[in-house]
């Protein structure tokens, strides 16, 4: 189920690559974020907190990613026309509850100007 299109700029282009921004509420402490291209899982990142507030970050499908207190950025490089597709951020919230899964996304358009060495 698609909950909605992202209500923010999801794609940031730079140097022939793209940063895909997946946001989550900043009160969330433990979650899994997956990046889907169409129905295929490209990347995932899981953040958990153990005893003593020890943070653990795990990836089963590894992509270059960056975590902040309210977003996960996934980076795709060497863009070509085959990257044009619907991309979705699949967020599973574990803590604080309730458990919640949301799917938000948008279409990544690839233009010639973004294929190489362009800064946006």
């Amino acid at each position: 189920e698609i909950n909605g299109s992202a209500n923010y700029e999801m794609f940031i282009f730079h140097n022939g690559g793209v940063q895909i921004l997946c946001k989550y509420p900043d009160i969330v402490q433990q979650f899994k974020m997956q990046l889907l291209k169409g129905g295929q899982i490209l990347c995932d990142l899981t953040k958990t907190k153990g005893s003593g507030n020890t943070v653990s970050i795990k990836s089963l499908k590894f992509c270059h990613s960056q975590l902040s207190n309210n977003s996960v950025s996934f980076f795709l490089y060497n863009l070509d026309h085959s990257h044009a597709n619907y991309y979705f951020c699949n967020l599973s919230i574990f803590d604080p509850p309730p458990f919640k899964v949301t799917l938000t996304g948008g279409y990544l358009h690839i233009y010639e100007s973004q294929l190489c060495c362009q800064l946006k």
Epitope: N7, D26, Q29, D95, P97, P98
Partner: antibody
Framework: QVQLVQSGAEVKKPGSSVKVSCKAS????????MHWVRQAPGQGLEWIGL????????NYNQKFQGRATMTVDKSTSTAYMELSSLRSEDTAVYYC??????????????WGQGTTVTVSS | EIVLTQSPATLSLSPGERATLSCSAS?????MHWYQQKPGQAPRLLIY???KLASGIPARFSGSGSGTDYTLTISSLEPEDFAVYYC?????????FGQGTKLEIK
């Protein structure tokens, strides 16, 4: 039905502490986190903090850090908020509110009826 | 801290009229929620995620906006709608409420 029932009104002396309770019913207590919010007389609403019943993780508004303590008793499905070193400005109605998520954000979907705390010498 | 400024502070209208309440954020927020509060009662959720209607809330209530400017609209006022309305943002810590708009009968 889903209900949050809070403890009765309290009158406290400056410098003392107050502990407000919030008993949940009509849902599985550990499946939701709990927030605390207060409203001073004739004023707006102010977020105090959140406790995860699942992990006991707490998140406090910096303004209340060190003075507010949120706890839960899973056996009785009750959340507590204790405020210490009370001063007259803490006179307010204190509410518990259940955490929920939409597609983009979080909100309070169910509220307790409120507990009036009066701080007076 | 993100400051939410609601306007007007008081809105005097008659039943059947349309009410437009505004909430302006001091910096951009991802979404806004709206609560209604009647005297002696706890707040009640009306709108979440900017535009989604909470369970049991009549369709005459609607929400819109983005960035720093958000609006709650009541298309045709009913007698039970006269109350205080608060906007709330949960996207920038510490999470904050607006000061409220009192909707009163003209």
């Amino acid at each position: 039905q889903v209900q949050l029932v809070q403890s009765g009104a309290e009158v406290k002396k400056p410098g003392s502490s107050v502990k407000v309770s919030c008993k949940a019913s009509g849902y599985t207590f550990t499946d939701y986190a709990m927030h605390w919010v207060r409203q001073a007389p004739g004023q707006g609403l102010e977020w105090i903090g959140l406790i995860s019943i699942y992990s006991d993780h707490t998140n406090y508004n910096q303004k209340f850090q060190g003075r507010a303590t949120m706890t839960v008793d899973k056996s009785t499905s009750t959340a507590y908020m204790e405020l210490s070193s009370l001063r007259s400005e803490d006179t307010a109605v204190y509410y518990c509110g259940r955490n929920n998520y939409g597609n983009y954000g979080w909100y309070f979907d169910v509220w307790g009826q409120g507990t009036t705390v009066t701080v007076s010498s | 801290e993100i400051v939410l400024t609601q306007s007007p502070a008081t809105l005097s209208l008659s039943p059947g009229e349309r009410a437009t309440l505004s909430c302006s954020a001091s910096s951009s927020v991802s979404y806004m929620h709206w609560y209604q509060q009647k005297p002696g009662q706890a707040p009640r959720l009306l709108i979440y995620d900017t535009s989604k209607l909470a369970s049991g809330i009549p369709a005459r209530f609607s929400g819109s906006g983005s960035g720093t400017d958000y609006t709650l609209t009541i298309s045709s006022l009913e007698p039970e709608d006269f109350a205080v309305y608060y906007c709330f943002q949960g996207s920038g810590y510490p999470y904050t409420f607006g000061q409220g708009t009192k909707l009163e009968i003209k």
